[in-house]
């Protein structure tokens, strides 16, 4: 499956939007840093089947969408930027869904890669728990925004590696 050229442009736009969502200077938030235990192994070059990688990327973007579409995120972050962000993520999800269908077919996909998808979900649960414990403070959002930018960058790298293997 060939992801369209617009997909990588959308990735870059999403990252730019995340960067623009900064509300406070991050230098005051160092003490709020947290280890979310990003599931690095799901993004490494193991004997990754392309279909598995696409499923993991899809889950990553879906969970990012869920995280940023809560009432709390709307209250903490710029709504115009969030709306643009949703549009980019929605397009990414559509691109990846088309690919999943082509690569493995809709029936096998969720079951075959359950462990990988579960690892991504647990990662986002940890992020949500952190925000709850920190009462959705400005610094907590700043830490989460930085974390999502990092994980998003790693997702983009995985997509680039997939493209180069074609």
């Amino acid at each position: 499956c060939d992801l369209p050229q617009t997909h990588s442009l959308g990735n870059r736009r999403a990252l730019i939007l995340l960067a623009q969502m900064r509300r406070i200077s991050p230098f005051s938030c160092l003490k709020d840093r947290h280890d979310f235990e990003f599931p690095q192994e799901e993004f490494d070059d193991k004997q990754f089947q392309k279909a598995q990688a696409i499923s993991v990327l899809h889950e990553m973007i879906q969970q990012t969408f869920n995280l940023f579409s809560t009432k709390d995120s709307s209250a903490a972050l710029d709504e115009t930027l969030l709306d643009e962000f949703y549009i980019e993520l929605d397009q990414q999800l559509n691109d990846l869904e088309s690919c999943v269908m082509q690569e493995v077919g809709v029936i096998e996909s969720p079951l075959m890669y359950e462990d990988s998808i579960l690892a991504v979900r647990k990662y986002f649960q940890r992020i949500t728990l952190y925000l709850t414990e920190k009462k959705y403070s400005s610094c907590a959002w700043e830490v989460v925004r930085a974390e999502i930018m990092r994980s998003f960058s790693l997702s983009i790298n995985l997509q680039k590696r997939l493209k180069s293997k074609e």
């Epitope: 960067a19 900064r22 200077s25 991050p26 230098f27 005051s28 938030c29 160092l30 003490k31 709020d32 840093r33 947290h34 280890d35 979310f36 700043e142 830490v143 930085a146 974390e147 930018m149 990092r150 960058s153």
Partner: antibody
Framework: EVQLVQSGAEVKKPGESLKISCKGS????????IGWVRQMPGKGLEWMGI????????AYSPSFQGQVTISADKSISTAYLQWSSLKASDTAMYYC??????????????WGQGTLVTVSS | DIQMTQSPSSLSASVGDRVTITCRAS??????LNWYQQKPGKAPKLLIY???SLQSGVPSRFSGSGSGTDFTLTISSLQPEDFATYYC?????????FGQGTKVEIK
Amino acid sequence: EVQLVQSGAEVKKPGESLKISCKGSGYSFTSYWIGWVRQMPGKGLEWMGIIDPSDSDTAYSPSFQGQVTISADKSISTAYLQWSSLKASDTAMYYCARHPGLNWAPDFDYWGQGTLVTVSS
Amino acid sequence: DIQMTQSPSSLSASVGDRVTITCRASQSINEFLNWYQQKPGKAPKLLIYFASSLQSGVPSRFSGSGSGTDFTLTISSLQPEDFATYYCQQSYSTPLTFGQGTKVEIK
């Protein structure tokens, strides 16, 4: 391979201006902050300030606020430390180092080789 | 500002000795404490981050412990290449601050 390469040694007179540089390579320059550290002859390490190259946001140590300016040009992956009017007491080795920002990763894991600044009349 | 106080300021030891350096913060910094090694004419090198995590490529004879205000760097068996100056540094809040350093010399 991650590298921070600093500009060469400088010999200046009191009152002169100076801008030294730190060029990052082998990693995404805007994904890490760049910190500056001073070491006066025979002395310990002093943190001067830090910059986020993605948007040039800065934080300074109160001891250095107003004395130096930290800047960055992300298009050429370079951070700068500058003085508008040097003093003899600015004579020191200056190091740049990268910092992971708010991400859970090692602080100041890579350092430049240092730039020796000598200020003498 | 958070003050970082290291002790001792210098020590003499022999190859094979167990060496312990302590660092005390003027307020709680949780585990946001790093240890660096510096040799004459060289840039500092990160040894330990987040109080106890060993930086990649650093020998396992180096270890860090502590949280809150009191921290320790231990070299389990001193090697000839370990004679250097060691600095602790807090990354809990800006301004980031270093300890004054501990010079480890040959006895």
